[in-house]
Interface confidence: low
């Protein structure tokens, strides 16, 4: 894509000119002392407050003043005498300046001579102070004369710049950093024969000026428009320019504010929150129990979520963050909270065995329940003969030795787990004592 002077649809934005170095065709004895307003070293780029506002600093258009190589404006003085002595044309046009205009169709340049009168050029090569059909990167010699000055004429060497379409202003901003940074870079998209050492690049963004081919602006506000004007100079002559208005990407959303999160039942929990201030698309709610993590995508309009099918008496750590899908997905900081679900009845003990250890003694064992669902651990054994409860024991482990039972009697053994809040379903086995062997 070729550089455009201003983006479409921003007709109200004035494009300021950059301050330009003196357009000198011949080296001057003195150094070029032109300086630029603003200091890039310590200037901070601030958009104006308000949504998507373009900084005022970017919109201060200024008049372009063409300067001589010494940096001072060219003022012609004439001493009035009876027979005025004419200067030489070489002297009169010593500090002549030139602008280059490019024709994209013919791919040729026109050099515009910045003089007040219509000068003549040797070989009739200029019309209305313009030298036409100049090929990029080629030198052309023009002999300038006028009836107000005498020989010798001014010999002007036109050092023609490269073609404008060989350069493209490229947005080099990394998408990951596009919320707070802008990168702009001039790319050479075709080769040319001009000496690249003679090409200088200039950017002006607000009050910040850079003499670089690539600029990077950092610490910017997300979701704001910033305007940068740029130009390329060849031997200190501007030959192309471009402006870009770049809107920084959406920033990371802020952290949601959790109002409360709690569990009021064994299998349920609830979390409520206030959304973050900045733009976002959706929420991600993650809940972690021990080593398991589950995450849900939640609609941006939600401010409450009921968690179902939770495990009883389990600590859940919840994290809630907002995210926005911009040039990349940006996640906001996560707000964290936790709760422990209420107790519930434990599951049944399993692998229960009843074995006879002597004529009137039994050994009852079982395995712990798969889900304890509560704070404590206690095993209970009830032994019934007929409808009569003959034993009721409680141990830390499921290992009971039941002695002094009646011989030749049918017994029902019920083992269950109690978690401190709830008992579990009993495991029931029937077993009979034998006749005494003696």
């Amino acid at each position: 894509q070729s550089p455009t002077p201003s983006p479409t649809g921003v007709s109200s934005v004035q494009t300021p000119h950059l301050p330009t170095h003196a357009d000198s065709q011949t080296p001057s004895a003195g150094t070029d002392t032109q300086t630029f307003s603003g200091s890039a070293a310590n200037a901070k780029l601030n958009p104006t407050p308000g949504s998507n506002a373009i900084s005022d600093a970017y919109l201060n258009a200024s008049e372009t003043t063409t300067l001589s190589p010494s940096g001072s404006a060219v003022i012609s003085t004439t001493t009035i005498a009876t027979t005025p002595s004419k200067p030489t044309c070489d002297e009169k046009y010593a500090n002549i300046t030139v602008d280059y205009l490019y024709n994209k169709e013919t791919k040729l340049f026109t050099a515009k001579l910045n003089v007040n009168e219509n000068v003549e050029c040797g070989n009739n090569t200029c019309t209305n102070n313009e030298v036409h059909n100049l090929t990029e990167c080629k030198n052309a010699s023009v002999s300038i004369s006028h009836n107000s000055c005498t020989a010798p004429d001014k010999t002007l060497i036109l050092d023609v710049p490269p073609g404008v379409e060989k350069f493209q202003l490229h947005d080099c901003t990394q998408v990951e950093k596009a919320d707070t940074t802008i990168c702009l870079k001039w790319k050479n998209i075709e080769t040319f024969t001009c000496d690249t050492q003679n090409i200088t690049y200039r950017f002006q963004c607000g009050n910040m000026i850079f003499d670089n081919k690539e600029i990077k602006l950092e610490n910017l506000e997300p979701e704001h428009e910033y305007k940068c004007d740029s130009e390329i100079l060849y031997n200190n002559h501007k030959f192309t320019n471009a402006s870009k208005i770049i809107k920084t990407d959406f920033g990371s959303p802020g952290e949601p504010q959790i109002i409360f999160c709690r569990s009021e039942a064994a299998h349920q929990g609830v979390i409520t929150w206030n959304p973050p201030q900045r733009s976002f698309h959706n929420f991600t709610l993650c809940y972690i129990k021990e080593t398991e993590k589950d995450c849900l995508n939640l609609d941006k309009n939600l401010i409450k979520y009921d968690l179902q099918n939770l495990k009883p008496y389990t600590k859940y750590v919840l994290s809630l963050h907002a995210y926005i899908i911009a040039k990349v997905q940006r996640n906001g900081s996560a707000a964290m909270c936790h709760f422990t679900t209420k107790s519930a009845p434990p599951s049944q003990v399993w692998n229960m065995t009843v074995s006879m250890t002597s004529d009137n003694s039994m050994h009852v064992k079982c395995r712990p329940p798969r889900d304890r669902n509560g704070p404590h651990e206690r095993y209970h054994l009830e032994v019934e003969a007929g409808n009569t409860l003959v034993r009721n024991e409680s141990h830390k482990n499921c290992d009971f030795r039941v002695k002094d039972l009646q011989y030749s009697t049918d017994y029902t053994f019920k083992a269950y787990f109690h978690n401190g809040d709830y008992p579990g379903e009993p495991f029931i086995l029937h077993h009979s004592t034998s006749y005494n062997s003696k």
Partner: antibody
Framework: QVQLVESGGDLVKPGGSLRLSCAAS????????LSWIRQAPGKGLEWVSY????????KYADSVKGRFTISRDNAKKTLHLQMNSLRAEDTAVYYC????????????WGQGTLVTVSS | EVVMTQSPATLSVSPGERATLSCRAS??????LAWYQQRPGQAPRLLIY???TRVTGIPARFSGSGSGTEFTLTISSLQSEDFAVYYC?????????FGGGTKVEIK
């Protein structure tokens, strides 16, 4: 309380292999990034490797890259360091350490296990 | 990698006196710097992170300051249990790197 217990340190010949383990307890193991950090006898600390919650993000010091492999078993609450092609300069006490929740600094460390590489 | 340089290597201080330990980074690490204490035969213990944020439970006599490349750990009034080796660690860049340590010994 939070505990990290390293094991597997031993005397091994140059070129040999060793697998270190770090058993964790007292915290939600799967919710923390972990690291191995070593300390040669009488010397300072040197970071070795780092692993994310699920093991999808792993980093190694250049000195061990291609020879050491970090892994974790969240179900068993264990961190491992497989060390191959061992060199004399790998001799050190190896600590496993837990990263704080938000910053790449280490709030809990094990007591370390000594690895000696010598012929 | 970011090279962390601690000075002095050894600091001799009397109990009750102030100790100032320095840590310098070879390039800016912003405020991403931590300090650890290691007593003989023990694992390191985190004291400070973010250059100046004290870890919960660490006494107020320990304070950190600095940003960029120059950092300081100050122990305002040395107690007997403070005589140990202190390490700084940067976490601004991979690989994570530690300083060589400063041994604080009894004068």
């Amino acid at each position: 309380q939070v505990q990290l217990v390293e094991s597997g340190g031993d005397l091994v010949k140059p070129g040999g292999s060793l697998r270190l383990s770090c058993a964790a307890s007292g915290f939600s193991f799967s919710g923390y990034y972990l690291s191995w950090i070593r300390q040669a006898p009488g010397k300072g600390l040197e970071w070795v490797s780092y692993i994310s919650l699920s093991g999808s993000f792993i980093k190694y010091a250049d000195s061990v890259k291609g020879r050491f492999t970090i892994s974790r078993d969240n179900a068993k609450k264990t961190l491992h360091l497989q060390m191959n092609s061992l060199r004399a300069e790998d001799t050190a006490v190896y600590y496993c350490a837990r990263r704080t929740g938000t910053t790449t600094v280490f709030d809990y460390w094990g007591q370390g296990t000594l690895v000696t590489v010598s012929s | 990698e970011v090279v962390m340089t601690q000075s002095p290597a050894t600091l001799s201080v009397s109990p009750g006196e102030r100790a100032t330990l320095s840590c310098r980074a070879s390039q800016s690490v912003n405020s991403n710097l931590a300090w650890y204490q290691q007593r003989p035969g023990q694992a390191p213990r985190l004291l400070i992170y973010g250059a100046s944020t004290r870890v919960t439970g660490i006494p107020a006599r320990f304070s950190g300051s600095g940003s960029g490349t120059e950092f300081t750990l100050t122990i305002s009034s040395l107690q007997s249990e403070d005589f140990a080796v202190y390490y700084c660690q940067q976490y601004n860049n991979w690989p994570l790197t530690f300083g060589g340590g400063t041994k604080v010994e009894i004068k």
